[in-house]
């Protein structure tokens, strides 16, 4: 496991990053601010009723590259954007839901989801 701030770990930040959190605040957050060794994120996804829900928060360094890659999930419309360039940088992230395609409704059990690419902000 990489130590915080070690020079041998190119992706590790030398200092903690503070992020805005909403619907996704861990116990160690204060005043809707969380802390991480990884990324801030903002995500939009549909809830069970199809209503868009925006959440934001912190992603730890371990596994965050994968989470920020925004791999499409079958039967779920969602998009995530991540950033690290300054504290609370996720206040300025505004991901949008990938558009519904006609074939999402007519293809039966096989859904070809639109792959939304997010942008890393460094």
């Amino acid at each position: 496991k990489k130590e915080d701030g070690e020079s041998t770990a190119p992706t590790a930040r030398p200092k903690v990053l503070r992020c805005k959190c909403h619907h996704h605040c861990p116990e160690d957050s204060v005043n809707n601010i969380c802390s991480t060794d990884g990324y801030c994120f903002t995500m939009i996804e549909e809830d069970d009723s199809g209503t868009p829900v925006v959440t934001s928060g912190c992603l730890g360094l371990e596994g965050s590259d994968f989470q920020c890659r925004d791999t499409p999930i079958p039967h779920q419309r969602r998009s995530i954007e991540c950033c690290t360039e300054r504290n609370e940088c996720n206040k300025d992230l505004h991901p949008t839901l990938p558009p519904l395609k006609d074939r999402d409704f007519v293809d039966g059990p096989i859904h070809h989801k639109h792959h939304h690419h997010h942008h890393h902000h460094h």
């Epitope: 701030g5 030398p14 200092k15 116990e27 160690d28 991480t36 730890g60 300054r86």
Partner: antibody, heavy 116, light 112 residues
């Protein structure tokens, strides 16, 4: 090597304000947070707050909100803490400290005496 | 705020002895990232504190291997295997998991 230089002492009158300085050298100033810690004899260490020199983002201990204001001057790699409306309770040693995920290096501390 | 309780307040030892200092936190110090931000510092008279151990058990650069840290959750220990004269001073534990960051009240290591 990492150095955090602080003036040795400050003498200030009650009700006045004081701006304590902390000059950093030996590392990239904007790559680490700067924290400030208060130490009174027999009272242990108290965390005042922190500032990220890269964007001047601050976090304060609720107890010191309105008392302490943290700023930086990146051109001189210097962090400042202004303390206002001073009383005898503010007499203490104040340390600045470099922080990544924990305090790695401390300044020598400034002894602040509030007295008329 | 997280309260850090250190015991004992004073620890008289003979040179060469082992010393053990306990630090308990009022809530878990496991951060949401999985790290535990519990650290140990030594402050000698008239000096600023110096970092000994970070994140429970990692020795900071230049710290002799007679210093070791252990523990998890809310219960932590600093051990000095063979106390030397230069080890005397006040030891503080500190947490940087929860804002505001807090410190233990200190343990004074002194000669018996």
């Amino acid at each position: 090597q990492v150095q955090l230089q602080q003036p040795g002492a400050e003498l200030v009158k009650p009700g006045a304000s004081v701006k304590l300085s902390c000059k950093a050298s030996g590392y990239t100033f904007t790559s680490y947070w700067m924290q400030w810690v208060k130490q009174r004899p027999g009272q242990g260490l108290e965390w005042i707050g922190e500032i990220d020199p890269s964007d001047s983002y601050t976090l304060y201990n609720q107890k010191f909100k309105g008392k302490a204001t943290l700023t930086v001057d990146t051109s001189s790699s210097t962090a400042y803490m202004q303390l206002s409306s001073l009383t005898s309770e503010d007499s203490a040693v104040y340390f600045c400290a470099r922080f990544g995920y924990y305090i790695e290096y401390w300044g020598q501390g400034t002894t602040l005496t509030v007295s008329s | 705020d997280v309260v850090m309780t250190q015991t004992p307040l004073s620890l008289p030892v003979s040179l060469g002895d082992q010393a053990s200092i306990s630090c308990r936190s009022s809530q878990s110090l496991v951060h949401s990232t999985g790290n535990t931000y519990l650290h140990w510092y030594l402050q000698k008279p008239g000096q600023s504190p110096k970092l000994l151990i970070y994140k429970v058990s990692n020795r900071f650069s230049g710290v002799p291997d007679r210093f070791s840290g252990s523990g998890s959750g809310t219960d932590f220990t600093l051990k000095i295997s063979r106390v030397e004269a230069e080890d005397l001073g006040v030891y503080f534990c500190s947490q940087s998991t929860h804002v505001p960051f807090t410190f233990g009240s200190g343990t004074k290591l002194e000669i018996k």
